[in-house]
Amino acid sequence: ASTQSPSVFPLTRCCKNIPSNATSVTLGCLATGYFPEPVMVTWDTGSLNGTTMTLPATTLTLSGHYATISLLTVSGAWAKQMFTCRVAHTPSSTDWVDNKTFSVCSRDFTPPTVKILQSSCDGGGHFPPTIQLLCLVSGYTPGTINITWLEDGQVMDVDLSTASTTQEGELASTQSELTLSQKHWLSDRTYTCQVTYQGHTFEDSTKKCADSNPRGVSAYLSRPSPFDLFIRKSPTITCLVVDLAPSKGTVNLTWSRASGKPVNHSTRKEEKQRNGTLTVTSTLPVGTRDWIEGETYQCRVTHPHLPRALMRSTTKTSGPRAAPEVYAFATPEWPGSRDKRTLACLIQNFMPEDISVQWLHNEVQLPDARHSTTQPRKTKGSGFFVFSRLEVTRAEWEQKDEFICRAVHEAASPSQTVQRAVSVNPGLAGGSAQSQRAPDRVLCHSGQQQGLPRAAGGSVPHPRCHCGAGRADWPGPPELDVCVEEAEGEAPWTWTGLC
């Protein structure tokens, strides 16, 4: 199973089930669904003394992951005290930790309903200079609530003093307002109102709805590729309009910038498709610095037959950044594949999803048509991954047996690139005496014999060999041992393999 971080849940009793004269009380913390072991659970009991007991981990039957419970027993003035259970899982990462802060017991309560309302457009369907979002938190049992606004998952610095609470009978309602600039709203970010109440989280999210397009015609606006942006340093964006009916009227694609600054000269291409429709593309060079600094570009599509203009905008992706991890592999030789081999490259855990993948051989970039790379897909976590596949020929690896898989991504440091090298026959190319490679599994052979005969993967030591502790003069991977025959009066036989 692969590494999996735990989900952490507080374990509390109902307040009404705890006797009022109880001098001590036990609460717990459940960490579940993690792999591998161990987790470390610690408690912050504030000013109170407490004793803890962490139960041995149990295996979850279906997944093979683990679950464990830590119990804390406290005495004294526990009723008003909050307790924090801190769960660390170093196999996930050295600093992976999840804190849960909660009180000894849970009261019966009515949870809030969270709903975001947004201000209207003007009569012409255009957005005003500022947009108001109103978070309504309604119908909850009176108690402390915390409201946080998030933009694409990141906490926003918002003045919450304007939040107002009213009580209707036994239930309360609160509302909080967020004012956004038109630029922020149009940038396609997601806004979330997150409410914490009684140790639970409730939320609602909203973003600018996609325009309802005139039927049948679609427009798309691409971001520059990381390769164009960081390596060629000549980024372009492309506005693509598809499914246009050919007609006498001209399609106009007009570029603009949210800052109002002028745009570069664009190039335009029209293509008639097999199904009779027209595809129009307009490519606009953009300034590397302008793009990196977050400029928003708009493409406006007009046509006499369109009921109204189509608008598309693009800007640098916001949100957290993470550099890609890159791993490269070569497939083994199979019958019928002696003269070609497949190389693969796994690129994972990067954010945002914009990435360019290249293969290089002999310090020359191979044409994109040579390799096949998947579209970015989400990992189980918050990042993305792609696979890239390259077929190489014997002529290529005999010329130089080193192929480079390179990922270009904005979060990669220092030069926006991460690369790996892979060889078809690692360690054998060149045959340098200065750099050695432990051989594949080798049959027991005479020390006097020249050349080590290769055997199939399932070879075993000669029956009279025993496993030694590795040969100091063979600097191969440490898991390879050498078997030495102890026959008297003849040169020893050896077998190198996994003992």
């Epitope: 550099a323 991890e325 890159v326 791993y327 490269a328 592999f329 310090e363 080193e402 480079i404 990669a412 440091s413 991460v418 690369q419 790996r420 090298a421 892979v422 060889s423 690692p426 360690g427 060149g430 340098s432 750099s435 050695q436 490679r437 600097p475 991977p477």
Partner: nanobody, 117 residues
């Protein structure tokens, strides 16, 4: 041809320091993770530490806080700075190169002897 050449080994007193170098040629150095291994007489070879191609380092518990790895991609060289040396650090030290990122060290140097008296 790929070559990994260690240097800087020698005899040093306990508590002293040494700096090992490993010069690589014939490979695209910036694409490789580099590792240092050591093998004492009669013992299994053990990993001392590794440095990823992005500069992130990992060390065995036995050397943590005493040994430091670094790399100079412009010079195609990886270094192992060894401080507070102990007699049990006596071994042949090998450098190794892994291009895949998977921990498969494809290329190995010949080793350099470090003796701590």
């Amino acid at each position: 041809d790929v070559q990994l050449q260690e240097s800087g080994g020698g005899l040093v007193q306990a508590g002293g320091s040494l700096r090992l170098s490993c010069a690589a040629s014939g490979l695209t150095f910036g694409s490789y993770d580099m590792g240092w291994y050591r093998q004492a007489p009669g013992k299994q070879r053990e990993l001392v530490g590794r440095i990823r191609n992005d500069g992130i380092t990992y060390y065995a518990d036995s050397v943590k806080g005493r040994f430091t790895m670094s790399r100079d991609n412009a010079k195609n060289t990886v270094y192992l700075q060894m401080n507070s040396l102990k007699p049990e650090d006596t071994a042949v030290y090998y450098c190794a190169a892994d291009g895949t990122g998977l921990g498969h060290y494809d290329y190995w140097g010949q080793g350099t002897q470090v003796t701590v008296s």
